[in-house]
Interface confidence: medium
Amino acid sequence: MSSKYPRSVRRCLPLWALTLEAALILLFYFFTHYDASLEDQKGLVASYQVGQDLTVMAAIGLGFLTSSFRRHSWSSVAFNLFMLALGVQWAILLDGFLSQFPSGKVVITLFSIRLATMSALSVLISVDAVLGKVNLAQLVVMVLVEVTALGNLRMVISNIFNTDYHMNMMHIYVFAAYFGLSVAWCLPKPLPEGTEDKDQTATIPSLSAMLGALFLWMFWPSFNSALLRSPIERKNAVFNTYYAVAVSVVTAISGSSLAHPQGKISKTYVHSAVLAGGVAVGTSCHLIPSPWLAMVLGLVAGLISVGGAKYLPGCCNRVLGIPHSSIMGYNFSLLGLLGEIIYIVLLVLDTVGAGNGMIGFQVLLSIGELSLAIVIALMSGLLTGLLLNLKIWKAPHEAKYFDDQVFWKFPHLAVGF
């Protein structure tokens, strides 16, 4: 029997998504305008290229990275694109409202698009923990809540803790990870009998997931340096991220082999661990004074990532219902924390080295910032999870988890493709 999109969702999704899109168009009509002035052409091209790198990371990198399920690869890629497109629109408006609204108009620049893409990336990281268990209507809710929560978190951190754009955006790693994990915790967990095979990875989708990892690997330096304004900080960020991800690749592949009794390399470990270094240096990439430190961080991050991939999935599968191959959530939660700790250590060394007092105060501020990010992520994640459990969204039946055929029209319906 052909597997149609359930009738109720067929009514609910287009109506919900198109009404939302119409509302966004109206908001853009009334409240936004382009930056009308002539920017210098060289700066414009450079700024656009960074934005393009971020879009490639989001659409291709994260899109394909999450596509390793045997029967859920189409949905992973396309739903990611859908969320990115929606998330960027809402993030531009939200960021404008939060920072510029007293004027009644939001000015859209390439910088604001870059910022919005990074905010939308947060959703794509979080959603890895729930993909396959939710439909598009539910994902729309998740996008709206998470982008709103992140936007407000960034604004609060900027105003209370006096941090710059780069710093308050680099909480994205821990925020996205904890948000995704708390949403997953709220969703129905047990996989009914007979569907266990669907959350297994297959060779071709695994290859596309590796392609996603490669795109992320190539463009991670752009992500970590995107919001830094000083050329020297930007250069430091690019170099340090590059060294860190380079070392984490070597560590991931050799560590994966080391972790296997027969010395075999696990695709799942490699997918996530190659990115470990980029996440770990994210917060402090502009402050790290020399390459060897970034490389050591990449090594530690790679080992943590492989270790986590080996020992945490069992626990996450039982407690949160997250499949073995969706390890981005707990990976980023561990590595994001590592990155924040490294930043605090560097801040202390920097403060001591400068002969500047108030070390305790600086550390306290950093811990406060991190705690706030985690608390808001958990609270907004739980709220989202509760919202997604509402009957109105017609969530896929547990027997239909991780199944493209629920959502897509295939010319000939076959179980394997």
Partner: antibody, heavy 126, light 108 residues
Framework: QVKLLESGGGVVQPGGSLRLSCVAS????????MHWVRQAPGKGLEWVAF?????????YVDSVKGRFTISRDNSKNMVYLQMNSLRADDTAVYYYC??????????????????WGKGTTVTVSS | VVTQEPSLTVSPGGTVTLTCASS?????????PNWFQQKPGQAPRALIY???KKHSWTPARFSGSLLGGKAALTLSGVQPEDEAEYYC??????????FGGGTKLTVL
Amino acid sequence: QVKLLESGGGVVQPGGSLRLSCVASGFTLRSYGMHWVRQAPGKGLEWVAFIWFDGSNKGYVDSVKGRFTISRDNSKNMVYLQMNSLRADDTAVYYYCAREKALRGISRYNYYLDVWGKGTTVTVSS
Amino acid sequence: VVTQEPSLTVSPGGTVTLTCASSTGAVTRGYYPNWFQQKPGQAPRALIYSTNKKHSWTPARFSGSLLGGKAALTLSGVQPEDEAEYYCLLYYGGAQLVFGGGTKLTVL
């Protein structure tokens, strides 16, 4: 109490040189980015140059590039502005400014001018 | 080029907003706008940094924000002693900081 005191101003002929100095008291210069700003008589403020806490990066306004050099001596808590090939349009009061407290996240690279000296007058005239 | 209103007049107790525009485009938080007050014969004094952050010595009646692609300084409940020249400063990345031309505020 944070205080900045400039010195070295005076009258000089076009093409001549001067070296402005500034000493800081109440805090250590090696913590912060330092700037020189000038104000021509009856005109507005013009940012001239900056140097980072460790001297690793310097910046100059286009009109003084190649003629002015900013430097610092952290051991003496001093910052200097060496001005060569002076022109009539360099006539101004030169203020020295510093960042009093670091912005977290870019703690090393500060572009805020919290504390200002009283200024020293440079007159370029024949 | 950074542009400010050449002069503004306000009554004591009134509210006035000074703006700061950049010729390269909309001013965002990433320009880290600063505002300074300078009274005749005195050195400038910092009021606002990083768009809206106040120094410990900045009176509560001064506030910074972004308005329609410009940096803005709002004075609420203007006092006679607020009569001065006000300058904004924008950071353009790398080694470029640029002051605005200044706004002469007259309190009548």
